[in-house]
């Protein structure tokens, strides 16, 4: 396979990565598509040009119980609750009870390495796409989509509106994160197009919740994830020697 070739022996520099990707491009094109059925790597959806892999959580170890309160200080003013003179009944009746009766199907136990949204094998046409959250509501949110407490310096990354709070990065991410970041940079340069993966959180544990956090490729791509995966494995193997 091309990753064994000389161009892919040293993936520590960007130029080498580019060479490796160029060398592997024919192999990648010849691969079986990740989403079979429509002749290329795109899922069968209403919008085949968009490849979304929402909420990849490389870093989630087991299931967290995030029942911490998000309450702000007690002295904060209230904007959303209008004052009422008395406590009379509401003019309109409340909602009628639903007869959904749906019982939840809890996930089976804890997994040591929780990757339930890393959907290599998800059926054709399925992709996770949460609705974006705009906490500031009617204010212009292009610069500040989330509370400051959640913001982290995103070096080399664009904070897309609607994307969410980012917890502090783990110190242990280290070399693997560097490699992965280089691969992503290489992928973007290769295509010279908007390959946006700015909230693809490789190494940091979630704070309370990741919002948005999906990646999209606006142009049809060869399945570079396969290359990334193999390159990462290869790199890890080399380090182990």
């Amino acid at each position: 396979w091309c990753l064994e070739s000389s161009q892919c022996q040293d993936l520590t520099t960007e130029s080498n990565l580019l060479e490796c990707i160029r060398a592997c491009k024919p192999d990648l094109s010849a691969e079986t598509p990740m989403f079979p059925g429509n002749g290329d790597e795109q899922p069968l959806t209403e919008n085949p040009r968009k490849y979304v892999m929402g909420h990849f959580r490389w870093d989630r170890f087991g299931r967290r119980n995030s029942s911490s309160s998000g309450s702000s200080g007690a002295g904060q003013k209230r904007e959303d609750v209008s004052a009422g003179e008395d406590c009379g009944p509401l003019p309109e009746g409340g909602p009628e009870p639903r007869s959904d009766g749906a019982k939840p199907g809890p996930r089976e136990g804890k997994r040591s390495y929780s990757m339930e949204h890393f959907r290599w094998g998800k059926p054709v046409g399925k992709k996770r796409r949460p609705v974006k959250v705009y906490p500031n509501g009617a204010e212009d949110e292009s610069a500040e989509a989330f509370p400051l407490e959640f913001k982290r310096e995103l070096t080399g990354q664009r904070l897309r509106e609607g994307d969410g709070p980012d917890g502090p990065a783990d110190d242990g991410a280290g070399a693997q994160a560097d490699l992965e970041h280089s691969l992503l940079v290489a992928a973007e340069k290769k295509d010279e197009g908007p390959y946006r993966m700015e909230h693809f959180r490789w190494g940091s544990p979630p704070k309370d919740k990741r919002y948005g956090g999906f990646m999209t490729s606006e142009k049809s791509q060869t399945p570079l994830v396969t290359l990334f995966k193999n390159a990462i494995i290869k790199n890890a193997y080399k380090k182990g020697e």
């Epitope: 809890p106 996770r128 949460p130 609705v131 500031n136 509106e161 969410g164």
Partner: antibody, heavy 114, light 110 residues
Framework: QQQLEESGGGLVKPGGTLTLTCKGS?????????MCWVRQAPGKGLEWIGC???????TYYPTWAKGRFTISKPSSTTVDLKMTSLTAADTATYFC???????WGQGTLVTVSS | DIVMTQTPASVSEPVGGTVTIKCQAS??????LAWYQQKPGQPPKLLIY???TLKSGVSSRFRGSGSGTEYTLTISDLECADAATYYC????????????FGGGTEVVVK
């Protein structure tokens, strides 16, 4: 200050077609937002109809709405909801909203009756 | 599709009291949950997102908690102005029927 306003509601006969418009002020749909439609039948709860990603034009609907409801972005300041084959069950106040936020229009009432 | 079951349908508490509203998802929605307050003749207003994050400007008397499939909105030190209908909404996945509202809870303040 961003604002949304729905229009196009009114009385329509069963089987008819109606297009509602959500007009934004202080907000440009040429930017990327999730703009959604939600409805509420009189005295009932809220029901999600679908959303459009105004940047890409991608649309998303629940199974029940697919085929009969179509969300589009005809201009940089408006998002439309086209409803076909209307029945009495579609009688509701229709809201447009910016994703998950407090930015909602006041709603427009659609009454389907013969 | 994800079904949100909200309980109770209606609750009545005196001023100063506490109300607890529960929302159960038919599958794990990973805290992609919002709580809204709606008063008659008005559109809903966002109170909480991410299951527990309070929207700026909303009183800290509103508290959201939960994870997985079970979520709770707690309103403490009830005021008359809290009389409204409250809805939970999951925004987990627009692409796979993963956005829906709970049936709503009418809160009456005595």
């Amino acid at each position: 200050q961003q604002q949304l306003e729905e229009s196009g509601g009114g009385l329509v006969k069963p089987g008819g077609t109606l297009t509602l418009t959500c007009k934004g002020s202080g907000i440009a749909f040429s930017d990327t937002y999730d703009m959604c439609w939600v409805r509420q039948a009189p005295g009932k709860g809220l029901e999600w109809i679908g959303c459009i990603d105004t940047g890409s034009g991608d649309t998303y609907y629940p199974t029940w709405a697919k085929g009969r409801f179509t969300i589009s972005k005809p201009s940089s300041t408006t998002v439309d909801l086209k409803m076909t084959s209307l029945t009495a069950a579609d009688t509701a106040t229709y809201f447009c909203a910016k994703g998950v936020s407090s930015l909602w229009g006041q709603g427009t009432l659609v009454t389907v009756s013969s | 599709d994800i079904v949100m079951t909200q309980t109770p349908a209606s609750v009545s508490e005196p001023v100063g009291g506490t109300v607890t509203i529960k929302c159960q998802a038919s599958e794990d929605i990973e805290s992609d949950l919002a709580w809204y307050q709606q008063k008659p003749g008005q559109p809903p207003k966002l109170l909480i997102y991410g299951a527990s994050t309070l929207k700026s400007g909303v009183s800290s008397r509103f508290r959201g908690s939960g994870s997985g499939t079970e979520y709770t909105l707690t309103i403490s030190d009830l005021e008359c102005a809290d009389a409204a209908t409250y809805y939970c909404q999951t925004y987990y996945d627009m692409a796979d029927d993963g956005c829906s509202f709970g049936g709503g809870t009418e809160v009456v303040v005595k």
